[in-house]
């Protein structure tokens, strides 16, 4: 439950987050699980701990192993584990399955490929994108913030896409790459003003404090391929990326599904270790296309319990 898989390539930066959450004031100690040796916090070290984050700058194959993080409150120590695997760079263009992040889908006029794990890094735009190891060139490809947009997607755009960016740490630059598959759904159709399927407007969702919860923002935009169709979450009217609460993350990719022939997009807001303050936030599901913007609001409330003794 408190273990997380992470992977990277040798000579690249890798940053891993402790799977245990706590107050930002809590101290987090990191250890090599096998030797119980403490990981230093001094940034001059190649591998060092920085609060909830463990940084490999750069990573080496020998770094592979299980790392223990201990979140220390004044009264308790909570333990988590990061299972890290560092692979040798492949001599050829082939990216093995074990290096692939989750697959994303697109369609003729709606394609976004998000760069996985990028939120953990200190990077600056633009990203570099490659398909099957070839640098993407041409006006059809637009690197926008942390994702790639492909105009007029065709079936042969399917393949493995790699994002490459530079992580900056105290003036030193480190390369990071991440690869995921992209599949194309080829359909003709039409577009409509967005229809949000979930959540219902002004819905309230009961949650357990201390548990994880997911909020799905799902909207349909017409039939077949869509030129522009996006859904996203906002917190109190702010973008998730501006909110700077690591427990609350919008999933990197936007899944495209076709419900009764309709083109529907959804994105999941993942809230780890739900806290009291999360109940005070307003969660807005935004659906946007060329016809306009629609917004549905959902709030969280505490689940009521019957205690048995």
């Amino acid at each position: 439950k408190f273990s997380k898989q992470s992977w990277g390539l040798e000579n690249e930066a890798l940053i891993v987050r402790c799977p245990r959450q706590g107050k930002s004031s809590y101290i987090v100690d990191w250890y090599y699980s096998q030797t119980n040796k403490s990981i230093p916090t001094q940034e001059r070290n190649r591998v060092f701990a920085s609060g909830q984050l463990l940084k490999f700058l750069p990573a080496e194959v020998a770094d592979s192993g299980i790392y223990t993080c201990i979140v220390r409150s004044p009264t308790f120590n909570r333990t988590g584990y990061a299972n890290v695997t560092i692979y040798k760079k492949q001599p050829d263009c082939n990216v093995p399955d074990y290096l692939m992040y989750s697959t994303v889908s697109g369609s003729e006029k709606n394609s976004k490929i998000y760069c996985p794990t990028i939120d953990l890094y200190n990077w600056t735009a633009p990203l570099e994108w490659f398909k099957n190891c070839q640098a993407l060139q041409g006006s059809r490809y637009k690197a926008h913030k942390s994702f790639l947009v492909i105009d007029n997607v065709m079936t042969d755009d399917a393949g493995d896409y790699t994002c490459k960016f530079i992580h900056n740490e105290n003036g030193a630059n480190y390369s990071v790459t991440a690869t995921r598959s992209f599949t194309v759904k080829d359909e003709q159709g039409f577009s409509l003003f967005p229809v949000i399927r979930a959540p219902a407007h002004n819905e309230t969702k009961e949650v357990e404090i201390g548990e994880n919860t997911n909020l799905t923002c799902s909207a349909c935009f017409g039939k077949g391929a869509q030129f522009l169709a996006t859904v996203q979450w906002q917190l109190n009217g702010n973008k998730i990326t501006d909110f700077s609460e690591p427990r609350i993350q919008q999933e990197e990719g936007q899944n495209q599904s076709f419900s009764n022939g309709l083109a529907c997009v959804n994105t999941v807001l993942r809230i780890a270790d739900v806290k009291e303050e999360d109940l005070l936030l307003r969660y807005d599901c935004l659906a946007l296309n060329l016809h306009g913007l629609r917004r549905h609001t959902i709030r969280l409330s505490r689940k009521h319990h019957h205690h048995h003794h």
Partner: antibody, heavy 117, light 106 residues
Framework: EVQLVQSGAEVKKPGATVKISCKVS????????MHWVQQAPGKGLEWMGR????????EYAEKFQGRVTITADTSTDTAYMELSSLRSEDTAVYYC??????????WGQGTLVTVSS | DIQMTQSPSSLSASVGDRVTITCITN??????IHWYQQKPGKAPKLLIY???TLRPGVPSRFSGSGSGTDFTLTISSLQPEDFATYYC????????FGQGTKLEIK
């Protein structure tokens, strides 16, 4: 050594309100959570609720919802538990305890509240 | 709702005995369970948290085991000071104490 010192015993009439204090020493109350637990005579422990004193967020067990209010004064490192609409079955020892979200580590000595007409 | 069944409710044993107390939940709560000891007129004392982590200063004769839905507190060799009431506490879903187990001298 962390110490939690609670206010003294109280005798209240049914329908009244009681407010118990819990003063923390050798510990900054903002750094963790404060829980309150009820124990009726000869009975087991019952968790009532908790507060994050740093931001004032509270959460209560359903049994006590609507009657209990937990507060904290970070300037004096003191937590408070107020229980209203008292009835005879609220006669119990009430404990404050500090801990994280999930458990209690250090406990106060307990405050006996007797509800009697 | 998470329901907890602690057993036995009372137990008679002798100094030197090995004693086990069980808590069973109606749903998988991983290791988010804790064990407390309470003596008459005193506040509870935390012995073990997150299933099997011994609180500093607690004698090693106390141990916790189990995961999922079945959890056990074991006292390997009872000492005179161990006669008390023991409670499990789950914190996977808010906080709920077990009913308690009163450990008495035989």
């Amino acid at each position: 050594e962390v110490q939690l010192v609670q206010s003294g015993a109280e005798v209240k009439k049914p329908g009244a309100t009681v407010k118990i204090s819990c003063k923390v020493s050798a510990f900054n109350i903002k750094d963790d959570y404060m829980h309150w637990v009820q124990q009726a005579p000869g009975k087991g422990l019952e968790w009532m609720g908790r507060i994050d004193p740093a931001i004032g967020n509270t959460e209560y067990a359903e049994k006590f919802q609507g009657r209990v209010t937990i507060t904290a004064d970070t300037s004096t490192d003191t937590a408070y538990m107020e229980l209203s609409s008292l009835r005879s079955e609220d006669t119990a020892v009430y404990y404050c305890a500090t801990g994280d979200f999930y458990a209690m580590a250090y406990w106060g000595q307990g405050t006996l509240v007797t509800v009697s007409s | 709702d998470i329901q907890m069944t602690q057993s036995p409710s009372s137990l008679s044993a002798s100094v030197g005995d090995r004693v086990t107390i069980t808590c069973i939940t109606n749903t998988d709560i991983d290791d988010v369970i804790h064990w407390y000891q309470q003596k008459p007129g005193k506040a509870p004392k935390l012995l073990i948290y997150e299933g099997n982590t011994l609180r500093p200063g607690v004698p090693s004769r106390f141990s916790g085991s189990g995961s999922g839905t079945d959890f056990t507190l074991t006292i390997s060799s009872l000492q005179p000071e161990d006669f008390a009431t023991y409670y499990c506490l789950q914190s996977d879903n808010l906080l709920t104490f077990g009913q308690g187990t009163k450990l008495e001298i035989k």
